[in-house]
Each structure stands twice: as C-alpha cells, then as structure tokens.
Amino acid sequence: TPLGPASSLPQSFLLKCLEQVRKIQGDGAALQEKLCATYKLCHPEELVLLGHSLGIPWAPLSSCPSQALQLAGCLSQLHSGLFLYQGLLQALEGISPELGPTLDTLQLDVADFATTIWQQMEELGMAPALQPTQGAMPAFASAFQRRAGGVLVASHLQSFLEVSYRVLRHLAQP
C-alpha cells in the first residue's frame, strides 16, 4: 500500500540517510572530476552506446515516486540498487593509481549506506532475503573500457542518488 511522508521511518534514520547520500554524491563527483581531468572523459552522454555494449545496468527506483510511495518496496529497491553499485564499483578496481583512493572511499561509503538502509528495514521487520551473490557484472577488456565504465557507473550512481535524495527528503518533511 502507498505510504506518504507520515510514514513509520524515524527522523534520525532519514537525516542519517540524507547525510550519507550527500557524502556519496561528493565522492562520486570527485571521481568524475578526476576522470575528466586525467583522461578527458568528461561527458557520460557520449559514452552511452559503449555503456550498452559493456552491459552496465541501471538500478530502478520505481517503487519510490512520492505520489504513490511503497515503503517496503522503496527501501528494498534502494538497498538492491546500492548492492548493484557495490558490484559495479568492484568491477572498476585497478582503474588507475590516481583514482584508486577516491574509488576506495566511494565503495566503502556505498556499502555503509546499504548497511544503514538494511538496519532500518530489519527494525521495521521488512528486511528482504540476503542476496546470495552479485549478478553478472560487466567485464572491461581494456584500460579505456574500464575508465569509460568508471564515467558511466559514476553518472548512473549520481542519478540514482538524486532520486534517492528527493525521496528521502520528501519522507523527512514533517
């Protein structure tokens, strides 16, 4: 059933999530800036076709529109999306020494955000079954593909976070 802003989510949880989203957005922006400055890969829209051929997936948030938000479904999609991005970021490992530390921090912050979402779902008695394994992740055949993949994954993640932020801010409104 749809659930609006007057939901059963504690304000402390929502504020924590908003903090974490903005932290990850900052990490993601730093990764994008470094990819642009170091490799002149500045425009994700120019790499969309490559993204299709590499099989870089998108994470849906279809259960989260503010008009008909389904709380359990939305939190579950948030968690699943973060789980997906953990795998995509893992596939980028070894992208380049210059980008390594930024990617490492981004990976951990995404994992910590997934933990926060799961914790709350568990407290509400709606934690889904644990995903046993990651789905098939893109395989990058060259350094260029990995860097281009980095641009696309960062761009997809930022879009996912923008939607997440809007949903969480809507829920946090008194």
Epitope: E19, K23, Q86, P101, L108, D112, T115
Partner: antibody, heavy 119, light 112 residues
Framework: QVQLVQSGAEVKKPGASVKVSCKAS????????MHWIKQAPGQGLEWIGY????????NYNQKFRDRATLTADKSTSTAYMELSSLRSEDTAVYYC????????????WGQGTLVTVSS | DIVMTQSPLSLPVTPGEPASISCRSS???????????LYWYLQKPGQSPQLLIY???NLASGVPDRFSGSGSGTDFTLKISRVEAEDVGVYYC?????????FGQGTKLEIK
C-alpha cells in the same frame, strides 16, 4: 547483543604466516563491513583494511596490501585476517571492529589477538 | 594519507579537574554535507578501544556527558569537564573522511 570473539594468541617464526579469526554474533553478519586494526606494543592504532562480506570485497591500507589477506565466511559469520612473510615488526595485537556509519563505526570491537613473531 | 597529530602525548590530571586533548588533521575533515568526520576513542588499560564521540561532537551511546567534542575542519578538542578515576587510558582521535582511515598517536591520561 553484538559480540566479536577473536582467536587466541599466536607465536610464529619470521617468514611464517598467521591467520586470525573474528566470529561475529548478535547481528546479520554479511550486512556490515569488518575492519582490522593493528596495535604494536606501546604504540597507537593502525588501520589495516576491511572486508565487505556481502560481496566478498576487501580493501587494504597500501602499507599492508602485499602481505595481508582479508576474507569472510558467511556460513559461520566469521571474518579472517591472514598475514604472510611475518617479521618482528608484525608483533602486535590485532583487532577486528565492525564497520558502519555515524555512531555505528567501530562501536563494537573484538578482544584482540596478540601475534608474536620471534625466532 | 591524512595525518592526525595529537597533543599532549601525556596528560596527568587531578580527579575532579577538567582535561583537554587536542587533535589536528593534515586536511579538513569537514565534508560538503556539513558533517565533520572526526572520531574519538578511549582505550582503557588492558581493554579494546571504545567509541566516545562520533562526527566531532556527538556523544556515543552510554558515554557520560562530562565528555564533549568540538572543533573546526582541522583542529579538534576533546574535553572532560571533571576527570574521574575511570577515565584513565589512552585517547585516540581518528578520521573516517577517506581511506585509509587514520588515527592520532594517542594521549595517555593518568591520575596525579
């Protein structure tokens, strides 16, 4: 309640390897990252790295990257830290600590495992 | 890597008196999200470290309110308003803004 119980003290010869375990209970193990921290005798704390059990991904402090291996067994809710090619400066207490965000980060620690490297 | 520097390294205090420990980071720990990613831990003799303060100024669960944390982006202070015998141990500041996480060298608080 959350508990992290580590394996007992070890004495090893230089060049050998050691594997320290950290058994977690009281929470859903794969959901949280597990971090490892070194404390040499009379010294401060040094972050070694972490393992994300849900995807089996480990990340290391550059200083430990060549010799430390972090793993996790979801079926037994146990995290492991293996240190190879031991030398005298590896003599230390090694702690596992549960990750998380905000007030969750390192809110729970194992009791520590003393590893002594001596010929 | 972000370098964390604490002072003093040793702090003898009379019970009931206040105490103050400083910590400096080589890079600002204030993120654009408004959060300062600075933590304080206490390691009592023979024990594992325990979380005291998270995100610069928030008291962890179960920590007495005689402890407080403050600071700016790079300079931080842990204050104990009235030291008690149970407060002895080594205090560490730590950053978790970015990997690798790093700790200060520690400040040993002892009772005079």
């Amino acid at each position: 309640q959350v508990q992290l119980v580590q394996s007992g003290a070890e004495v090893k010869k230089p060049g050998a390897s050691v594997k320290v375990s950290c058994k977690a209970s009281g929470y859903t193990f794969p959901i949280y990252t597990m971090h490892w921290i070194k404390q040499a005798p009379g010294q401060g704390l040094e972050w070694i790295g972490y393992i994300n059990p849900s995807i089996g991904y480990a990340n290391y402090n550059q200083k430990f990257r060549d010799r430390a291996t972090l793993t996790a067994d979801k079926s037994t809710s146990t995290a492991y830290m293996e240190l190879s090619s031991l030398r005298s400066e590896d003599t230390a207490v090694y702690y596992c600590a549960r990750g998380g965000y905000g007030d969750s980060l390192f809110a729970y620690w194992g009791q520590g495992t003393l590893v002594t490297v001596s010929s | 890597d972000i370098v964390m520097t604490q002072s003093p390294l040793s702090l003898p205090v009379t019970p009931g008196e206040p105490a103050s420990i400083s910590c400096r980071s080589s890079k600002s720990l204030l993120h654009s999200n408004g959060i300062t990613y600075l933590y304080w831990y206490l390691q009592k003799p023979g024990q594992s470290p325990q979380l005291l303060i998270y995100q610069m100024s928030n008291l962890a669960s179960g920590v007495p309110d005689r402890f407080s944390g403050s600071g700016s982006g790079t300079d931080f202070t842990l204050k104990i308003s009235r030291v008690e015998a149970e407060d002895v141990g080594v205090y560490y500041c730590a950053q978790n803004l970015e990997l690798p996480y790093t700790f200060g060298q520690g400040t040993k608080l002892e009772i005079k």
